[in-house]
C-alpha cells in the first residue's frame, strides 16, 4: 500500500479504562499530531479508519463494529465502548486517509479491574487542596461527552471504601465535592460513581482521584490535625465501628 505518515505508538497517551464501563476515546491525531480538526478532515474527503492489535499479538485486525447492542462504535473522531470488556486491552490505531494522503497513530488502551474499595492499577490524578483555606471543591473528572446535558445523572461519592455521608467538612454536591475546610485528615482517594441512562440501558462511570492537603498558598498553615476520623460525626463513627472492628485505613472491608 502507499506510504503513510506513521507517528508510531504514542505511549504518552497510555489510556486506562475500567472494565464493564463506557469509554470514549478520541483519535490522538487531531489532538496532538495534525494541525487540523476532524471536521476539516471530513469535509476534505478524508476517512478515519480504526483497527487494533490485541494484547500479546502482532496481528493488526479491524475493529468489529457489528457487535450486539453496538458495543463498539465510532462517532466522528471518537471510538466508543458501551461498555468495555477486559479483552479489549491492546494497541489501537486510527488512520486518516484518502487516495493521496495518509496519516496514522497508535496508542495503548488498558482495560483494568477495580476491587471492592475502588483500588486498581489505574494511575490517579492528584488534586491539591490548601489546608484550612475556606471552601474548596473537587470535580468528578473525565465525564464530559458521555451523556447530553438533557440527561441528569446521579453521582455518589466515596472516600476510600466509605460512601461520603455524615462527614462534617466534606459535602457531596452533584459532580462536585466540597471541602468546607481542608484538613490533613482529608488526604486520601475520592471516588465518584456516575450513573446515567442511554438507549434503554443504564451505565456507570467510576472516577477516582487523590486529594493531597498542602500548606496554604501564603506559606503559613494552620496546625495539621492528624486524626483520620476527623470529619465524621457520631453517626459516621458508629457506622465505622459497627459489627467488625475495622480501621479507617484498612481498605479491605467495605462499610458505610
Amino acid at each position: 500500500s502507499e506510504r503513510c505518515d506513521d507517528w508510531g505508538l504514542d505511549t504518552m497517551r497510555q489510556i486506562q479504562v475500567f472494565e464493564d464501563e463506557p469509554a470514549r476515546i478520541k483519535c490522538p491525531l487531531f489532538e496532538h499530531f495534525l494541525k487540523f480538526n476532524y471536521s476539516t478532515a471530513h469535509s476534505a474527503g478524508l476517512t478515519l479508519i480504526w483497527y487494533w492489535t490485541r494484547q500479546d499479538r502482532d496481528l493488526e485486525e479491524p475493529i468489529n463494529f457489528r457487535l450486539p447492542e453496538n458495543r463498539i462504535s465510532k462517532e466522528k473522531d471518537v471510538l466508543w465502548f458501551r461498555p468495555t470488556l477486559l479483552n479489549d486491552t491492546g494497541n489501537y490505531t486510527c488512520m486518516l486517509r484518502n487516495t493521496t494522503y495518509c496519516s496514522k497513530v497508535a496508542f495503548p488502551l488498558e482495560v483494568v479491574q477495580k476491587d471492592s474499595c475502588f483500588n486498581s492499577p489505574m494511575k490517579l490524578p492528584v488534586h491539591k487542596l490548601y489546608i484550612e483555606y475556606g471552601i474548596q471543591r473537587i470535580t468528578c473528572p473525565n465525564v464530559d461527552g458521555y451523556f447530553p446535558s438533557s440527561v441528569k445523572p446521579t453521582i455518589t461519592w466515596y472516600m476510600g471504601c466509605y460512601k461520603i455521608q455524615n462527614f462534617n467538612n466534606v459535602i457531596p454536591e452533584g459532580m462536585n465535592l466540597s471541602f468546607l475546610i481542608a484538613l490533613i485528615s482529608n488526604n486520601g482517594n475520592y471516588t465518584c460513581v456516575v450513573t446515567y441512562p442511554e438507549n434503554g440501558r443504564t451505565f456507570h462511570l467510576t472516577r477516582t482521584l487523590t486529594v493531597k492537603v498542602v500548606g496554604s498558598p501564603g506559606g503559613g498553615s494552620g496546625k495539621p490535625i492528624p486524626n483520620p476520623l476527623l470529619g465524621l460525626d457520631s453517626t459516621g463513627l458508629n457506622d465505622i465501628f459497627e459489627a467488625q472492628k475495622i480501621e479507617w485505613h484498612e481498605h479491605h472491608h467495605h462499610h458505610h
Epitope: 475500567f18 472494565e19 464493564d20 470488556l85 477486559l86 479491574q113 477495580k114 476491587d115 471492592s116 474499595c117 475502588f118 446521579t154 455518589t156 466515596y158 460512601k163 455521608q165 460513581v193 450513573t195 443504564t202 456507570h204 467510576t206 457506622d239 459497627e242 479491605h252 472491608h253 467495605h254 462499610h255 458505610h256
Partner: antibody, heavy 118, light 107 residues
C-alpha cells in the same frame, strides 16, 4: 443481556445446611456486588449480605452473620450462599441480586425456594 | 437499623386511578430510596432509585419523590399490568432495609 440464574428448589431437614447458587452472565461478574435477599410470606424482604467477587470482600446484615456464608467463584461467574443450622424460620424464597457499589439492585435472580422440614 | 414504614399495606384500585404509596424512614436517608415492583411468582424489578430517578425502561406513569425521611411513589394512571406488590428500600446505609410492601388489587 444480564441474567442471574439460580439453582432449583431445596427440601432439607432441620439442622442441616444448604448451598444455593447464582450463575451470572451478560456482565463483568468480578466487578459488581452480588447480594442475597430473603423473602418469607407476610415478612417482606430482608437483606442478608453481599459479596464482591473480584476480591471476595463481604458485608453481612448482623442478623444473618452466623446463618449465611457468601462465596463466589470467578472462573464460573457463580455466587454461592451457604445457610447452616437450618430451622423452619429459614424456609423462604432466596434471591440473588446485583448492585454496582450503589446499594440498590438492578438485576435479580428468579429465586430459590428453600423448605426446611422437621 | 433504619426502619422503612410503608403505607398502605393494601390498596384497592380501578384502571386509570392515581395511586400514591408512602414510605417513612426512621432516620434521615437523604434521597437514597429505591422502589421495586414484584408480581406473583416473580422476582422484584427495580423501578426507581435515588427517590426520583426512573430506571431504564420504566414507563413514565411511575414517579417518585421525597428526601430525608418521607418518600412518595406515584402511579399516575394505573394499568392492569401494574397490579403487583410495591416495596421501598433505603440504599443509604447498612444493613439495607425494605418496607413491608403495598399490594395493589382490583376494586
Amino acid at each position: 443481556q444480564v441474567q442471574l440464574q439460580q439453582s432449583g428448589p431445596e427440601l432439607v431437614k432441620s439442622g442441616a445446611s444448604v448451598r444455593i447458587s447464582c450463575k451470572a452472565s451478560g456482565y463483568a461478574f468480578s466487578g459488581s456486588w452480588m447480594n442475597w435477599v430473603k423473602q418469607r410470606p407476610g415478612k417482606g424482604l430482608e437483606w442478608i449480605g453481599r459479596i464482591y467477587p473480584g476480591d471476595g470482600n463481604t458485608n453481612y446484615n448482623g442478623k444473618f452473620k452466623d446463618k449465611a456464608t457468601l462465596t463466589a467463584d470467578k472462573s464460573s461467574s457463580t455466587a454461592f450462599m451457604q445457610l447452616s443450622s437450618l430451622t423452619s424460620e429459614d424456609s423462604a424464597v432466596y434471591f440473588c441480586a446485583r448492585d454496582y457499589y450503589l446499594f440498590y439492585f438492578d438485576y435479580w435472580g428468579q429465586g430459590t425456594t428453600l423448605t426446611v422440614s422437621s | 437499623n433504619i426502619v422503612m414504614t410503608q403505607t398502605p399495606k393494601f390498596l384497592p384500585v380501578a384502571a386509570e386511578d392515581r395511586v400514591i404509596i408512602t414510605c417513612k424512614a426512621s432516620q434521615d436517608v437523604s434521597n437514597e430510596v429505591a422502589w421495586y415492583q414484584q408480581k406473583p411468582g416473580q422476582s422484584p424489578k427495580l423501578l426507581m432509585y435515588y427517590a426520583s430517578n426512573r430506571y431504564t425502561g420504566v414507563p413514565d406513569r411511575f414517579t417518585g419523590s421525597g428526601s430525608g425521611t418521607d418518600f412518595t411513589f406515584t402511579i399516575s394512571s394505573v394499568q392492569v399490568e401494574d397490579l403487583a406488590v410495591y416495596f421501598c428500600q433505603q440504599h443509604y446505609s447498612s444493613p439495607l432495609t425494605f418496607g413491608a410492601g403495598t399490594k395493589l388489587e382490583l376494586k
